[in-house]
């Protein structure tokens, strides 16, 4: 039997989303203008390509990566696109208001679009923990709160700790992971009888999730290098990320086989573990002085990811109600922490190697940054979770979790489409 979109949400969603879009258009009209300078066109194209890579990662990579549910694949891809589109608009405005606004108007450049896409990516990472359990109206709230929280976190870190764009954006991994996990913790957890099959993965959606993983794998070097200030740092970041993700693929596939009693390879492990190296080197990708270090980090990250995928889902499912295939949240939380630890270790080595003093102070600052990112993620995530539980959003009933038919019109309704 087909399940119609609840009448109340049908009234609430278009009104809420279109009102918000109208408000964004007005804000853009009054407060923004394009960078008027005449740049070298070839340079602009090269700069745009980085932004394009990030958009591909977000729309195709993360969109398809989260589409492995048997009966929630359409919603995963389309809702991701919806959140990306909304998130980028709000992030451009927010970043402009926080950094440029005293001068009058927000100047939009290719860089601001790049930055906004990366901010929106945070939501797409977080939402993996709650997709299937929320409707679009709730996702709009999640986008607004998370992008705002991340923007403010980045501004606070920049002002207090004096870090550059790359460093304060690379907290995105732990921020997004802990934000998503704390939102999931607030949502109703138990899956009622008879709906367990919906959060299982199916072959074709799993293939599309693998496609998403491949896109992310290909473009991760662009993500890790996008905000670095000089070509030499970008080159180092690209190389180190590439080596790390290459090794994490090998580790993911072989580790997955090793973890299975019959030596079978798990699709779910591979989906997430292929990206492990990219997350783990993110913070320090420009600082790693030689390829073998990046490769070792990729190996460790791959093993952690496979180990996590094997042992953590049970715990996450019980405590947070996160399905077995939605492992991005805890994966990124572990790997993001690993990346931050590696950064601190490199900082110490660099400080000692250069004969500098104040090692303890520098380490303390880095730990302070990380702690602040986690605290703000948890607090804003809990706030979002509480907001999403409000009755006004007409959240899908637990019996309708992970069900495309709640949201989509299908020409012929069949189970397992």
């Amino acid at each position: 039997m087909s399940s119609k979109y609840p009448r109340s949400v049908r009234r609430c969603l278009p009104l809420w989303a279109l009102t918000l879009e109208a408000a964004l258009i007005l804000l853009f009209y009054f407060f923004t203008h394009y960078d008027a300078s005449l740049e070298d066109q070839k340079g602009l194209v090269a700069s745009y390509q980085v932004g394009q890579d990030l958009t591909v990662m977000a729309a195709i990579g993360l969109g398809f990566l989260t589409s492995s549910f048997r009966r929630h694949s359409w919603s995963s891809v389309a809702f991701n696109l919806f959140m990306l589109a909304l998130g980028v608009q709000w992030a451009i405005l927010l970043d402009g208001f926080l950094s440029q606004f005293p001068s009058g108007k927000v100047v939009i450049t290719l860089f601001s679009i790049r930055l906004a896409t990366m901010s929106a990516l945070s939501v797409l990472i977080s939402v993996d923990a709650v997709l299937g359990k929320v409707n679009l109206a709730q996702l709009v709230v999640m986008v607004l709160v998370e992008v705002t929280a991340l923007g403010n976190l980045r501004m606070v870190i920049s002002n207090i700790f004096n870090t550059d764009y790359h460093m304060n954006m690379m907290h995105i991994y732990v921020f997004a992971a802990y934000f998503g996990l704390s939102v999931a913790w607030c949502l109703p957890k138990p899956l009622p009888e008879g709906t367990e099959d919906k959060d299982q993965t199916a072959t074709i959606p799993s293939l599309s999730a693998m496609l998403g993983a491949l896109f992310l794998w290909m473009f991760w070097p662009s993500f890790n290098s996008a905000l670095l200030r000089s070509p030499i740092e970008r080159k180092n970041a690209v190389f180190n990320t590439y080596y790390a993700v290459a090794v994490s693929v090998v580790t993911a596939i072989s580790g997955s086989s090793l973890a299975h009693p019959q030596g079978k390879i798990s699709k779910t492990y591979v989906h997430s573990a292929v990206l492990a190296g990219g997350v783990a080197v993110g913070t320090s990708c420009h600082l790693i002085p030689s390829p073998w270090l990046a490769m070792v980090l990729g190996l460790v990250a791959g093993l952690i990811s496979v180990g996590g995928a094997k042992y953590l889902p049970g715990c996450c499912n019980r405590v947070l109600g996160i399905p077995h295939s939605s492992i991005m949240g805890y994966n990124f939380s572990l790997l993001g922490l690993l990346g931050e630890i590696i950064y601190i270790v490199l900082l110490v080595l660099d400080t000692v190697g250069a004969g500098n003093g104040m090692i303890g102070f520098q380490v303390l600052l880095s730990i302070g940054e990380l702690s602040l990112a986690i605290v703000i993620a948890l607090m804003s995530g809990l706030l979002t979770g509480l907001l999403l539980n409000l009755k006004i959003w007409k959240a899908p009933h637990e019996a309708k979790y992970f069900d495309d038919q709640v949201f989509w019109k299908f020409p012929h309704l069949a189970v397992g489409f």
Partner: antibody
Framework: EVQLLEESGGGVVQPGRSLRLACAAS????????MHWVRQAPGRGLEWVAF????????YYVDSVKGRFTISRDNSKNTLYLEMNSLRVDDTAVYYC???????????????????WGPGTTVTVSS | AELTQSPSSLSASVGDRVTITCRAS??????LNWYQQKPGKAPKLLIY???SLQSGVPSRFSGSGSGTDFTLTISSLQPEDFATYYC?????????FGQGTKVEIK
């Protein structure tokens, strides 16, 4: 090869008018470096004005010139520009362009410094 | 981060040891550079990353410090060292210079 920067476009201009400074680079790969404009009012210290990333994708300005000055670059012509609108008397200064270089220190950490400077061009805003 | 240099001027003789300090209003780690400027000329980079000597700069110049307090030292002042010295931070936007220290002949 000698690494050089040469500013041009300075002159005397009335308040409220516009001026465009240019900085021609030679002897190095211009497209690989961030570039700054720094000014020095008569008898005063150095004041940073604007900065653009190596690819022109990101720009920064000191608060006093935001909305009036625009920094840009043409990597195909190895040239940096500073478009100055609504000029004020307190914009009178010698304007220098400077190259920002990543300087390796320790194992792998890069720090940034202005290692090549032009001789400067004088901008006088007076009625 | 605002930079405060001290002293604003000093008189010294050839062969003297000269120390100039620069204090940042917030932690800038080691992102501090020192420049020398002679009248009518462009500034010249002396020290980057708080303590690294730029190539071609005599070893009598040295820098130290981290966080908020930095020092430029000229171990034995030479006639060509009489100039104005500026500290500059590259940690975060807006990049800022100290107000300068003029080293004059006693």
């Amino acid at each position: 090869e000698v690494q050089l920067l040469e500013e041009s476009g300075g002159g005397v201009v009335q308040p409220g008018r516009s001026l465009r400074l240019a900085c021609a680079a030679s002897g190095f790969s211009f497209r690989s470096y961030g570039m700054h404009w720094v000014r020095q009012a008569p008898g005063r210290g150095l004041e940073w004005v604007a900065f653009t990333w190596f690819d022109g994708s990101n720009k920064y300005y000191v608060d006093s010139v935001k909305g009036r000055f625009t920094i840009s670059r043409d990597n195909s012509k190895n040239t940096l520009y500073l478009e100055m609108n609504s000029l004020r008397v307190d914009d009178t200064a010698v304007y220098y362009c400077a190259r920002e270089a990543p300087m390796l220190r320790g194992i792998s950490r890069y720090y940034y410094a202005m290692d090549v400077w032009g001789p400067g061009t004088t901008v006088t805003v007076s009625s | 981060a605002e930079l405060t240099q001290s002293p604003s001027s000093l008189s010294a003789s050839v062969g003297d040891r000269v120390t100039i300090t620069c204090r940042a209003s917030q932690n800038i780690r080691r992102s501090l550079n020192w420049y020398q400027q002679k009248p009518g000329k462009a500034p010249k980079l002396l020290i980057y990353a708080a303590s690294s000597l730029q190539s071609g700069v005599p070893s009598r110049f040295s820098g130290s410090g981290s966080g908020t307090d930095f020092t430029l030292t000229i171990s034995s002042l030479q006639p060509e060292d009489f100039a104005t010295y500026y500290c500059q931070q590259s940690s975060n936007t807006p990049w800022t210079f100290g107000q300068g220290t003029k080293v004059e002949i006693k």
